[in-house]
């Protein structure tokens, strides 16, 4: 049909943090490049119906469904979703194509379904059908990559059994220590599954999909380095593959490497060697020890020996189940308002943990750093000196761990007051928790020095706001003080703060704040 317009259907994914429902507009947001949805004519349908490829969207993701119409003259349109009509405002782009958009912000189950777009042009009428569904991420997995030797080749294959199929990359670095951080210029990334260059200092394989990114480092003993502070330890679960690389450099080829497990040479088929000459004509040898599926009896000290280097060992521990070892007792800290301070948790875990720091129902990203002694540490410094309860939560496939911290900020009390017909109350959040005094202001005591002791009821910590304790003091009204100004004062080691309250006003009470350091 020659009258049919040329149309294009596209999906635009947005990285946004807005929240709203369907908007039929060209909504400004940070966008990724559009994805062509095809829009083929639907056969055997009454009328002209175009069908776009099905769209799968993550929960809370934001998208735009867009139709570009290359047809002469004006167009009018209407969106229909679940029998409701939605406004449609076409506009024209620089190539004079009609553009119709449907923005879906923060995708939810209720926004999934069929979106019908009816377009009327001067020449013809037609319908475009979009089917939008929520991606079922329950079936998604992201597993830590592991290594296999490539059949008949001196190369390693990196495997990650994940859904959806992950992108696998090797992350290589030839420097020592800090310069091998992910974004360092010394780091080279290769987006492939097979790696032939196995002589580098630091070799990692990473797999990433919609769930994130997981990496596995090739455990290496370098005989040219001084040994680590404590014996390196490698944990594995029963059934996982074991790979340890021993590396040594010498002035010539006249040296050999051997692996021993508890003073017994490894069996043939559990190791393979590679060697190469480096740029300065020295020889590099590497000897891999590997077990395709470890059992409990593979536990022990693996020692790499050389005829020209000091030997070094690693302790391989095979566990039935993953673990997280750390002390879970809660910890309380008291700091000054401008004191630099970080919470920290030291732990040993296998497999690697995923963790979060939480404060006031808000989660913060959690970074972990490996220490020399086989432990890892996670620090949290972003507390902005807000007192309260902070929670560290860690988990891996087999274990969970939670640790509570309380942060108290030493500061002078701040007093808030409220009053009713029968009593007056004062509240303070200073730390250390303040003590209270009530004073009566009268002709006899214009400076409010006459202390009130009757009818005073102090409650320490009657309100816990995310771990922040609030102290209060209540004065019950008596005939002796009705009509007078009274002053409540909260004091601690850092100072005193007071509020003055008039006790007989029927409506809102006037409060006079009074800070005494």
């Amino acid at each position: 049909n020659q009258d049919l317009p040329v149309i294009k259907c596209v999906l635009i994914n947005h990285k946004n943090n807005d929240s709203s429902v369907g908007k039929s507009s060209s909504y400004p947001m940070v966008s990724e490049s559009p994805e062509d949805l095809g829009c083929a004519l639907r056969p055997q349908s009454s009328g002209t119906v175009y069908e776009a490829a099905a769209v799968e969207v993550d929960v809370s993701a934001s998208i735009t469904l867009q139709v570009l119409v290359d047809a002469p003259g004006n167009i009018s349109c209407l969106w229909v979703f679940k029998h409701s009509s939605l406004n449609c405002q076409p506009h024209f782009d620089l190539q004079n194509r009609g553009v119709v958009s449907m923005v879906i912000l923060k995708m939810t189950e209720t926004q999934a379904g069929e979106y019908l777009l009816f377009i009327q042009s001067e020449a013809t009428n037609y319908t475009i059908l979009f089917t939008v569904s929520i991606r079922n991420t329950l079936l998604y997995t992201l597993r830590r990559p592991y290594f296999r030797k490539m059949e008949n080749q001196d190369a390693l294959v990196c495997i990650s059994e994940s859904v959806p199929e992950p992108i696998v990359e090797w992350v290589l670095c030839d420097s020592q220590g800090e310069s091998c951080k992910e974004e360092s210029p010394a780091v080279v990334k290769k987006e492939e599954k097979v790696l032939h260059e196995l002589f580098g200092t630091d070799i990692r394989c990473c797999a990433r999909n919609e769930l994130g990114r997981e990496c596995t480092r090739l455990f290496t003993i370098d005989l040219n380095q001084t040994p680590q502070t404590t014996l390196p330890q490698l944990f594995l679960k029963v059934g996982e593959p074991l790979w340890i690389r021993c590396k040594a450099v010498h002035v010539n080829h006249g040296f050999g490497l051997t692996w021993e497990l508890e003073n017994k040479a490894l069996e043939e088929g559990n190791y393979f060697e590679m060697s190469t000459y480096s740029t300065n004509r020295t020889m590099i040898r590497i000897l891999f020890a590997f077990v395709s599926s470890v059992a409990r009896n593979d536990t022990g000290y693996y020692t790499c020996s050389s005829s020209k280097h000091p030997s070094q060992s690693a302790l391989v521990t095979i566990v039935e189940k993953g673990f997280i070892n750390a002390t879970n007792s809660s910890e309380d800290y008291e700091i000054d308002q401008y004191e630099e301070f970080c919470f920290s948790v030291r732990f040993k875990a296998y497999p690697q943990i995923r963790c979060t720091w939480t404060f006031s129902r808000k989660s913060f990203p959690c970074e972990q750093k490996g220490l020399d002694n086989g432990y890892s540490i996670s620090k949290f410094c972003n507390h902005k000196h807000q007192p309260g309860e902070y929670i560290f939560h860690a988990e891996n496939d087999d274990a969970q761990f939670t640790k509570m911290f309380t942060l108290n900020i030493r500061r002078k009390p701040q007093v808030l007051a409220e009053a009713s017909a029968s009593q007056a109350s004062c509240f303070s959040d200073g730390y250390p928790l303040p003590s209270w005094t009530w004073k009566k202001c009268s002709d006899k005591s214009p400076n409010c020095t006459e202390e009130i002791t009757e009818g005073v009821w102090n409650r320490k910590a009657n309100r816990k706001v995310f771990g922040q304790w609030v102290s209060s003091s209540t004065l019950n009204m008596s005939e002796a003080i009705k009509g007078f100004l009274v002053k409540c004062c909260a004091y601690n080691s850092l100072g005193t703060s007071c509020e003055t309250i008039l006790l007989n006003s029927p409506g809102p009470f006037p409060f006079i704040q009074d800070n005494i350091s």
Partner: antibody, heavy 122, light 107 residues
């Protein structure tokens, strides 16, 4: 037989540097770590650091970090320990000791040099 | 750093006596403990490595035992040449640390 022979006694002024040598013989030099340990008069033993002769990499005790440098010369099977900014408390006998490699943690010391006396005095 | 504490600091004994020196680590060091003997004006000499293994040429009267934090050096029958200072040393982690020494004197 396996032997470590150290350089002779030294007398230095405060603020100066001293470089002690330790020549190994009777074994493959690059196969064993070399430690430096010192002993002040009438005192116990104090570890200073370790060098891997096969690669030249080192690890120093915190106390000596920034003042000590350990190097090696594989052509002569010799290791060197240089201590700078000397003070009177550095007066001691300095020993080189071979790191035995039978144990899984390579910090045992199975062969010792005869010691070098360093006296720091103004 | 791991602290090593030896006891006693000094000990008087006679030839033929059975002598025991103990060494305690401030944390678990598995069996990474070495014992050395030092005579006046001489370099230390390795006696026992990894808590219980005798170095080459060490007489059978010397023995070591222990694991974790508590270790013992035993001389079953003192000989005149055994009067010296004995040091324990942990080789579990850097920095390797020594005990303060036990001086064994003739009674």
């Amino acid at each position: 037989q396996v032997q470590l022979v150290q350089s002779g006694a030294e007398v230095k002024k405060p603020g100066a540097s001293v470089k002690v040598s330790c020549k190994a013989s009777g074994y493959t030099f690059t196969r064993y770590y070399m430690h430096w340990v010192r002993q002040a008069p009438g005192q116990g033993l104090e570890w200073m650091g370790i060098i891997n002769p096969s690669g030249g990499s080192t690890s120093y005790a915190q106390k000596f970090q920034g003042r000590v440098t350990m190097t090696r010369d594989t052509s002569t099977s010799t290791v060197y320990m240089e201590l700078s900014s000397l003070r009177s408390e550095d007066t001691a006998v300095y020993y080189c000791a071979r790191g035995e490699t039978r144990s899984y943690a390579p910090y045992g010391m199975d062969v010792w040099g005869q010691g070098t006396t360093v006296t720091v005095s103004s | 750093d791991i602290q090593m504490t030896q006891s006693p600091s000094s000990l008087s004994a006679s030839v033929g006596d059975r002598v025991t020196i103990t060494c305690q680590a401030s944390q678990d060091i598995s069996n990474y403990l070495n014992w050395y003997q030092q005579k006046p004006g001489k370099a230390p000499k390795l006696l026992i490595y990894q808590a219980s293994n005798k170095d080459t040429g060490v007489p059978s009267r010397f023995s070591g035992s222990g694991s974790g934090t508590d270790f013992t050096l035993t001389i079953s029958s003192l000989q005149p040449e055994d009067f010296a200072t004995y040091y324990c040393q942990q080789s579990y982690s850097t920095p390797p640390t020594f005990g303060q020494g036990t001086k064994l004197e003739i009674k």
